[in-house]
Interface confidence: medium
């Protein structure tokens, strides 16, 4: 009989229902925007905006200051008052649409849905380790803002993304706003613009550069700006928009828009379609050849990557990569694949593709029929012609006009579909040691911290825990403050350590000590924790072996039993080879001699399941008593493994020594040709791992084995004679004298 240890699912080594409590702040309303500030004199702050209010928090998430930002027209509105005596526009609530830091001053800039989307500048005043906001400045000059030309109208009620860039001594605001016909008619915010903040903080300089969805497309062509960021020489916006101006507006895709961060102009505005797919390793029949498209970007973040992921992406460590969470459609509803997928786009490669797209448009040879694109922003044209023109004039350059790169940038899900039903709603990526970690918020209010690695068929979790009991979705924007990330869910802001909230979700010592170094996990007797949680017994260097099961559960008092032990932390080496004298097994008082591992039986174990097996030969001592006893495994002097060494003892109850008794054998005669079905009756006949019925020294082939009965077929006899019949269990003879008579056939 070839008994094998049952597999333990990998998930059994962790418990994601463990409750973690992280610092939080109740904002008193749905959090609309959040940004953090870290000064160079150890002062820091968290700014949290809700409808009609802006909170200033200290690094401990305690409230430092609160400012009324609305309703517009209300005498209590502190920001409105900065614009002088009103009225300044229709009354109404202020929903914060933009909350950004201007690093040059430094100052906080907030822009709301009221008062034509104007902004307010709040100088930062450090007070110890906390920060206060100075009285707000109204970034709006009534005399040079008109409904059809309004440099100070920044925020759109439909959503606006802003990235602030310092160029020389000036601050440039790169602004992208969602528009529709109604919004465009009211103080004309632009789709994409670059606005310079005036030195006297009275607003933005007039004559700014901008692109806007053409009036004829405003009703049907809506662009959602999902994320913006600045890295290297460029500012990037990420959009979700209809794939075509002319086709079905509900057929969406994702684009990256690139603007120069060194020249405040839009001639080199470029767009590129980002294509993220789920391509399962084994493709289902009927599944699309290139993988299932996930065209809609939900959240994004760019970050430098650690060594391992860099190698997998064929880029250098520390290179900036854009990570995006994509879904199949606006509702993110379930398809045949996972709900969310994560794709990685190296920035350097995005830039290369854009630059070469420009060459394709502007350099010889001319590619016939190649469109400049962006027909929602500009008149249609073919490369290399400028928008709306049939040919280049001598003083124009093909390169100095916006362009949609003709090829898309395609990537596949880093997680290979393993996010499954999880709907990711927030993303922030960090590099810890040489590991790249995705910190993700979910639709049901959980935080998943997972290593970004593409070569595995399971997720490597730092943590997976619930932020609170509300189960509300985690919001899109995440901020970092020191070694913590700030996530918003409902009306709460939560402070989550980048290294994870703790180690208690790791249930076994082995899993605990295999956790990433940055988590600071150690074993405290019977639980995994950080050093501060368990003074005294905390250690990171060894784990005891862990017995979970053994087979068989009984063995003969006389004779040997081949015992198989199951569990973990027996070897630490996949080969299962153990140095001499390191493993001691005792059953009761009796030693069990370790057996060399049968290499023919070694089989690869997928990391999703794990179990270790250890075999030994049990020969009871003469002093061993009948009855129940313990199995004990002690491991000492083992060389250390990659993460820890095995050292200690594990004891499991439930083994019994028994004495087999043979009571009756029938029939006692049969033909010389053999084949007689013998029935042996007794007690404890099935104990141990081996038994044999011998007729005149030849084995009688066993047909059935049970505790009280053995059935076997007699071998042929040499002559007609009475011959001895005996039963051996574990190689030792069961007491009793029996004979079998061979007769003529």
């Amino acid at each position: 009989e070839d008994w094998q240890c049952p597999r333990t699912p990998y998930a059994a080594s962790r418990d994601f229902d463990v409750k973690y409590v992280v610092p939080s702040f109740s904002a008193g309303g749905l959090v609309q925007a959040m940004v953090t500030y870290e000064g160079d004199r150890n002062e820091s702050a968290v700014f949290v905006a809700i409808r009609n209010r802006l909170h200033v928090l200290g690094p401990d998430l305690k409230s430092v200051q609160s400012l009324a930002t609305g309703p517009a027209g209300d005498p209590g509105c502190q920001t409105c008052a900065a614009c002088g005596p009103g009225p300044h526009g229709p009354p109404g609530d202020t929903d914060t649409k933009v909350l950004v830091l201007d690093p040059a001053l430094p100052a906080l800039v907030s822009c709301g849905s009221s008062l034509q989307g104007r902004c307010f500048l709040h100088d930062l005043e450090p007070q110890g380790t906390a920060v206060h906001l100075a009285a707000p400045a109204c970034l709006f000059s009534a005399h040079h803002n008109r409904p059809d030309d309004c440099p100070d109208c920044v925020a759109s009620p439909l959503g606006t993304r802003v990235t602030v860039v310092e160029q020389g001594q000036a601050s440039y605001f790169y602004v992208a706003s969602s528009l529709d016909a109604a919004v465009a008619a009211s103080f004309s915010p632009r789709s994409v613009s670059i606005r310079r903040l005036k030195a006297d903080a009275s607003g933005f300089a007039p004559g700014f550069v901008a692109l806007s969805v053409l009036p004829k497309h405003l009703v049907s062509y809506s662009i959602e700006y999902v994320h913006s960021f600045h890295t290297g020489a460029f500012v990037y916006f990420l959009t979700v928009q209809p794939a075509s101006v002319t086709d079905d507006p509900s057929a969406l895709h994702t684009r990256l828009a690139r603007l120069s961060a060194t020249e405040p102009e839009l001639g080199d505005y470029r767009e590129l379609v980002l294509d993220c797919r789920f391509a399962p390793k084994r493709r289902r029949r009927g599944a699309p050849e290139g993988g299932q498209p996930y065209p809609v970007l939900r959240v994004a973040h760019s970050a430098p990557v650690g060594a391992q992921l860099a190698t997998e992406l064929s880029i250098a460590e520390g290179q900036e990569v854009l990570f995006g969470v994509f879904v199949t459609g606006k509702d993110g509803g379930p398809g045949v694949g996972p709900n969310s997928v994560v794709c990685a786009f190296p920035i350097d490669l995005l830039d290369t593709l854009i630059d070469e797209g420009v060459e394709r448009c502007c350099e010889s040879p001319v590619h016939p029929g190649l469109r400049r694109g962006l027909d929602f922003f500009q008149s249609p044209s073919f490369c290399p012609n400028p928008p709306g023109l049939e040919a280049l004039s001598p003083n124009t350059s093909c390169r100095h006009f916006p362009l949609l790169v003709s090829s898309s940038f395609s990537r596949v899900d880093l997680f290979n579909g393993l996010l499954g039903p999880v709907q990711v709603t927030a993303l922030y990526v960090t590099r810890l040691d040489n590991v790249t970690v995705a910190h993700m918020g979910t639709m049901d209010g959980r935080i998943l911290q997972v290593e970004l690695v593409r070569s595995l068929n399971y997720l490597l979790y730092v943590s997976n825990f619930s932020l609170g009991d509300s189960g509300q979705p985690v919001q899109r924007d995440v901020s970092r403050l020191g070694d913590h990330l700030l996530f918003a869910s409902g009306d709460q802001v939560f402070q989550v350590p980048i290294q994870g909230p703790g180690c208690r979700h790791f249930l076994t010592c082995g899993r605990c000590l295999r956790a990433w170094h940055f988590m600071g996990c150690g074993w405290c007797g019977n639980m995994c924790g950080q050093q501060k949680e368990c003074p005294g017994s905390w250690q990171q260097d060894h784990c005891p072996p862990k017995l979970t099961e053994f087979h068989p559960h009984s063995g003969p008092l006389r004779g040997s039993t081949r015992l198989t032990l199951c569990g973990s932390n027996f070897y630490l080496h996949p080969s299962g080879l153990v140095p001499e004298g390191t493993h001691q097994v005792t059953v009761g008082q009796s030693p069990c001699r370790p057996l060399p591992k049968d290499s023919s039986k070694l089989r690869p174990v997928p990391r999703k399941d794990f179990v270790e097996e250890f075999e030994c030969e049990l020969e009871p001592l003469g002093t061993q008593a009948v009855g129940p006893t313990n199995v004990s495994l002690t491991v000492t002097n083992m060389p250390p493994g990659k993460h820890f060494r095995v050292d200690g003892t594990s004891v499991l109850r439930g083994f019994s020594f028994m004495e087999p008794v043979l009571i009756a054998v029938q029939p006692l005669f049969g033909p010389r040709a053999g084949g007689t079905c013998l029935t042996l009756e007794g007690q404890s006949l099935s104990v141990g791992t081996s038994r044999a019925v011998l007729v005149n020294g030849t084995e009688c082939l066993l047909a059935r084995v049970s505790e009280g009965q053995l059935l076997c077929a007699t071998p042929p006899g040499a002559t007609v004679a009475s011959v001895p019949l005996s039963l051996q269990v574990g190689g030792a003879q069961v007491p009793g004298s029996w004979t079998f008579q061979y007769r003529e056939d």
Partner: antibody
Framework: EVKLVESGGGLVKPGASLKLSCAAS????????MSWVRQTSDKRLEWVAS????????YYLDTVKGRFTISRENAKDTLYLQMSGLKSEDTALYYC???????????WGQGTLVTVSA | QLVLTQSSSASFSLGASAKLTCTLS???????IEWYQQLPLKPPKYVME???????STGVGIPDRFSGSSSGADRYLTISNIQPEDEAIYIC?????????????FGGGTKVTVL
């Protein structure tokens, strides 16, 4: 006019190292992916390595991975191929090429000969 | 595995129309390829990019008599009114990105002789 000029080839013994250079002119070097392609004595072409415009992304032929390193210095309009652990099968004429999104080699240099022989 | 197959040589009479074939491996029949020309003692020269639907764009300085077409796994380079200066080796090439790893392969080349 696009011009690519390779240098640095020569005769070396197996196991030795060599660094090839490619001086580029006539185009905005920092906007293009660049590649090295080699041609063996039987006239077969073999792509060796590619690098993105900014230099952050590199790709290699499996047989040279770990031995060859492609790099670029955009400030000097120069592409490099550092070759170590050279083998006799690396003997070839090495061309520097300008790639159009890595996948096509629109312009080629004249090549530099690398001979690996005991 | 991505493979391109070409016949090793072909001869054509002066002024004739020459059609060269490059065949993609069976699982890559939709791929766009490139054609290159290598004149004796010269580096290769980019001739054209050729898509699965037969559409193509030629490189700088390539005469109009060079055209491309496609059928299934086959990609054709046609030289109409072939001239002595067209005597060269014609090589096809193709690139692909698999799971962020890039490879580019060339065919063995077809040596064209003008009689």
């Amino acid at each position: 006019e696009v011009k690519l000029v390779e240098s640095g080839g020569g005769l070396v013994k197996p196991g030795a190292s060599l660094k090839l250079s490619c001086a580029a002119s006539g185009f905005i070097f920092s906007s293009y992916g660049m590649s090295w392609v080699r041609q063996t004595s039987d006239k077969r072409l073999e792509w060796v390595a590619s690098i993105s415009s900014g230099g952050g992304t590199t790709y290699y032929l499996d047989t040279v991975k770990g031995r060859f390193t492609i790099s670029r210095e955009n400030a000097k309009d120069t592409l490099y191929l550092q070759m170590s652990g050279l083998k006799s099968e690396d003997t070839a004429l090495y061309y520097c090429t300008r790639g159009q999104w890595l996948l096509k080699f629109a312009y080629w240099g004249q090549g530099t000969l690398v001979t690996v022989s005991a | 595995q991505l493979v391109l197959t070409q016949s090793s040589s072909a001869s054509f009479s002066l002024g004739a129309s020459a059609k060269l074939t490059c065949t993609l491996s069976s699982q890559h029949t939709t791929y766009t390829i490139e054609w290159y020309q290598q004149l004796p003692l010269k580096p290769p020269k980019y001739v054209m990019e050729l898509k699965k639907d037969g559409s193509h764009s030629t490189g700088v300085g390539i005469p109009d008599r060079f055209s491309g077409s496609s059928s299934g796994a086959d990609r054709y380079l046609t030289i109409s009114n072939i001239q002595p200066e067209d005597e060269a080796i014609y090589i096809c090439g193709v690139g692909e990105t698999i799971e962020d790893q890039f490879v580019y392969v060339f065919g063995g080349g077809t040596k064209v002789t003008v009689l």
